[in-house]
């Protein structure tokens, strides 16, 4: 039996700059029941506070609801592990909520096979920003990627689309079924997970319908 190992704050992420969650890796428990507490202060302020919500985001996590989330403030976050034999504290993590945004994936992905005047076929991929994203006010601006592959292929083909919420994919094989996903990233944040997969078959004998 021994004091607990040093916990490590794994990551902090916000879906929308309005709430955020931090997760930690516990380290060894020293063979004893061990309690974990997350404490934080804000840069330039003296007070230290304990995590407001250990439940919402699951085990080894702390959820900061709107009430506890400030932007333009740096949070200094530590996790403390305690058992009968002693305690240990993680290295502090400095968090600016503006820089930890990991949004939900884009929504309303639509796929349509179309044809140019020269009869060249393409796949028109369109989508919308994630629901929470207030793109129009400039609170968020998102960049996007799409990825696609034929059902037979092993590797995805990735296309960066910048701030555009549509993309035309050329040089697809007739008769093949293609899988498509999108993801997004805010100016100062992380890529979302890839969104729901959609599929479409490129017809063998595609003719433009009026």
């Amino acid at each position: 039996q021994s004091p607990p190992g040093k916990p490590e704050i794994h990551k902090c992420r916000s879906p929308d700059k309005e709430t955020f969650t931090c997760w930690w890796n516990p380290g060894s428990d020293g063979g004893l029941p061990t309690n974990y507490s997350l404490t934080y202060s804000k840069e330039g302020e003296k007070n230290t506070y304990e995590c407001p919500d250990y439940k919402t985001s699951g085990p080894n996590s702390c959820f900061f609801s709107k009430q506890y989330t400030s932007i333009w403030k740096i949070y200094i976050i530590t996790v403390n592990a305690t058992n009968e034999m002693g305690s240990s504290t993680s290295d502090p993590l400095y968090v600016d909520v503006t820089y930890i945004v990991e949004p939900e994936p884009p929504r309303n992905l639509t796929l349509e096979v179309k044809q140019l005047k020269d009869k060249k076929t393409y796949l028109w991929v369109k989508w919308l920003p994630p629901t929470i994203t207030d793109v129009k006010t400039g609170w968020f601006t998102m960049e996007y990627e799409i990825r696609l592959k034929s059902e037979e292929a092993d590797e995805w083909e990735i296309h960066f689309t910048g701030h555009q919420t549509q993309f035309k994919v050329f040089d697809l094989y007739p008769g093949q079924k293609y899988l498509v996903q999108t993801r997004c990233k805010p100016d100062h944040g992380y890529w979302s997970r890839w969104g729901q997969e959609k599929s479409i078959e490129i017809p063998n004998d595609f003719t433009l319908k009026d």
Partner: antibody
Framework: EVQLVQSGAEVKKPGASVKVSCKAS????????IHWVRQAPGQGLEWMGY????????GYNQKFKSRVTMTTDTSTSTAYMELRSLRSDDTAVYYC?????????????WGQGTTVTVSS | DIQMTQSPSSLSASVGDRVTITCRAS??????LAWYQQKPGKPPKLLVY???TLAEGVPSRFSGSGSGTDFTLTISSLQPEDFATYYC?????????FGQGTKLEIK
């Protein structure tokens, strides 16, 4: 016919700011990205960033991020690039260029260039 | 950031020659490569995008090839108006970067 017409040459002192304009015509302004690229005397091309006029989304080269602002005025189909805290090594020809309507980063039409000279 | 390396940096050739310029990316950029031609005092002109697609109005003596990290621009039969500086540029993801340029001169 697609055209990008840029504002005239500028001479600035170190520490000042410059704002270059780029007026687009011959296409739907909000459908295409506008990129800004610069070229120092006798040097190669350096990408500074881009703006998508449809939603004013921007992507900047980290090298310039703290000093540059790209904006658009959709009512006049004009893009602007402001560079602050000018230094002598910012002396260059600044180009605006239209991004391809599908692929973001290739530039199919270019402005004539605006010469910015930074000198004390 | 993705680095783009062009070779050669300069090249002397004669009218009618076949000329190849190469460009190497520091990581996989799939087919997201563009080629530009620039003449003194003028803005660059797009020749090729997506590694091999000729831009509108570009003569068929220009062609692009390659994917992944290695790319080439070929001029099948040099014309007097082709003497210029050529730049490659990746358009895979921001920041977009250019090669250092290849100056094509008359021998």
């Amino acid at each position: 016919e697609v055209q990008l017409v840029q504002s005239g040459a500028e001479v600035k002192k170190p520490g000042a700011s410059v704002k270059v304009s780029c007026k687009a015509s011959g296409y739907t302004f909000t459908d295409y990205n506008i990129h800004w690229v610069r070229q120092a005397p006798g040097q190669g091309l350096e990408w500074m960033g881009y703006i998508y006029p449809n939603n004013d989304g921007t992507g900047y080269n980290q090298k310039f991020k703290s000093r540059v602002t790209m904006t658009t005025d959709t009512s006049t189909s004009t893009a602007y690039m402001e560079l602050r805290s000018l230094r002598s090594d910012d002396t260059a020809v600044y180009y605006c260029a239209r991004g391809d309507g599908n692929y973001v980063g290739d530039m199919d039409y270019w402005g004539q260039g605006t010469t910015v000279t930074v000198s004390s | 950031d993705i680095q783009m390396t062009q070779s050669p940096s300069s090249l002397s050739a004669s009218v009618g020659d076949r000329v190849t310029i190469t460009c190497r990316a520091s990581e996989n950029i799939y087919s997201y490569l563009a080629w530009y031609q620039q003449k003194p005092g003028k803005p660059p002109k797009l020749l090729v995008y997506n590694a091999k697609t000729l831009a509108e109005g570009v003569p068929s003596r220009f062609s692009g090839s390659g994917s992944g990290t290695d790319f080439t621009l070929t001029i099948s039969s040099l014309q007097p108006e082709d003497f210029a500086t050529y730049y490659c540029q990746h358009h895979y993801a921001t920041p977009f970067t250019f090669g250092q340029g290849t100056k094509l001169e008359i021998k």
